[in-house]
Interface confidence: low
């Protein structure tokens, strides 16, 4: 999906008002220094691409993020403020439902959500700082 047509300011408002708090709730009890940020993004569309991937694509050791509150709110924000996003996600959602596992908060999931927090922060302050 091409995220360049999204309404970034509306998505930013959704993040600041609710998604950020849900991410903090998920990470509660975890030290902010526990995980190093290894995923970065340069522009807001690029950030949304990475956020979408980490939030909704199951990875080894963390298959359960898509049903978390922050993920559902992320999905809603993208569906509302990114034209045509919902249509591209129908098949992906159906496939995800078939392979949904029991909800478990693993260390790998905590690490992944820590990466998501970093990506969302970068979404609010875009532009890659490294050469």
């Amino acid at each position: 999906y091409d995220f360049t047509n999204c309404d970034f300011e509306k998505i930013k408002a959704a993040y600041l008002s609710t998604i950020s708090k849900d991410l903090i709730t998920y990470m509660s009890g975890t030290k902010s220094t526990e995980f190093n940020n290894t995923v970065s993004c340069s522009n807001r569309p690029h950030c949304l691409t990475e956020i979408q991937s980490l939030t909704f694509n199951p990875t080894a050791g963390c298959a359960s993020l898509a049903k978390e509150m922050f993920a559902m709110k992320t999905k809603a924000a993208l569906a509302i403020w990114c034209p045509g996003y919902s249509e591209t996600q129908i098949n992906a959602t159906q496939a995800m439902k078939k392979r949904r596992k029991r909800k478990v908060t693993t260390n790998k999931c905590l690490e992944q959500v820590s990466q998501l927090q970093g990506l969302w922060r970068r979404f609010n302050r875009p532009l890659l700082k490294q050469q």
């Epitope: 091409d2 360049t4 340069s42 522009n43 807001r44 569309p45 690029h46 302050r125 875009p126 532009l127 890659l128 700082k129 490294q130 050469q131």
Partner: antibody, heavy 117, light 107 residues
Framework: EVQLVQSGAEVKKPGASVKVSCKAS????????MHWVRQAPGQGLEWMGM????????TLIQKFKDRVTMTVDKSTSTAYMELSSLRSEDTAVYYC??????????WGQGTTVTVSS | DIQMTQSPSSLSASVGDRVTITCRAS??????LAWYQQKPGKAPKLLVY???TLAEGVPSRFSGSVSGTDFTLTISSLQPEDFATYYC?????????FGGGTKVEIK
């Protein structure tokens, strides 16, 4: 209305320094990055570097790392670009431009810097 | 660094002509390309960003497109006020680089 107003033209001798200012108005200064771009007479545009007004973090291209200092004064919403050890090839129009995603939606009017002995 | 190769460097056209300017990136920059118009003695003006999104207030005769690493700015019907120099610029990451410019002159 968003405006970036730059300081006036400067004439400098080789080896001297010049400090160009860029006063922003009409938006929240710390929300956008400030970039500096220069254009030598009859030439194209050359990106020099950028500063994040929220924390003053700067990124400069290699050729300017030793000679350029970018700063901001948040209290006056002003960005500064200082170029030292001036040489004749630094004669150019210097522009400030604001950005969020790397493209420039507003530019300053430009400041002409002439380096001549 | 990403190099932006812009062509042609200049062109002559008449009012009403369809004009196409191209820019090629040395590597994949996805849709992170902007186009600017500059008139003598003035600062550049943003026309297009994210390769194909028209900036606010820019006439619809301007359009941008992308195919791989090739980017195109098209002016569907050249107007007298369009005679200027046009620059492309990638905004994928640091360092930002511009194309060499295309001067559109009156035939």
């Amino acid at each position: 209305e968003v405006q970036l107003v730059q300081s006036g033209a400067e004439v400098k001798k080789p080896g001297a320094s010049v400090k160009v200012s860029c006063k922003a108005s009409g938006y929240t200064f710390t929300t956008y990055w400030m970039h500096w771009v220069r254009q030598a007479p009859g030439q194209g545009l050359e990106w020099m570097g950028m500063i994040d007004p929220s924390d003053s973090e700067t990124t400069l291209i290699q050729k300017f790392k030793d000679r350029v200092t970018m700063t901001v004064d948040k209290s006056t919403s002003t960005a500064y670009m200082e170029l030292s050890s001036l040489r004749s090839e630094d004669t150019a129009v210097y522009y400030c431009a604001r950005t969020l995603d790397g493209y420039y939606d507003y530019w300053g009017q430009g400041t002409t810097v002439t380096v001549s002995s | 660094d990403i190099q932006m190769t812009q062509s042609p460097s200049s062109l002559s056209a008449s009012v009403g002509d369809r004009v196409t300017i191209t820019c090629r990136a040395s590597e994949n920059i996805y849709s992170y390309l902007a186009w600017y118009q500059q008139k003598p003695g003035k600062a550049p003006k943003l026309l297009v960003y994210f390769a194909k999104t028209l900036a606010e207030g820019v006439p619809s005769r301007f359009s941008g497109s992308v195919s791989g690493t090739d980017f195109t700015l098209t002016i569907s019907s050249l107007q007298p006020e369009d005679f200027a120099t046009y620059y492309c610029q990638h905004h994928y990451g640091t360092p930002w680089t511009f194309g060499g410019g295309t001067k559109v002159e009156i035939k």
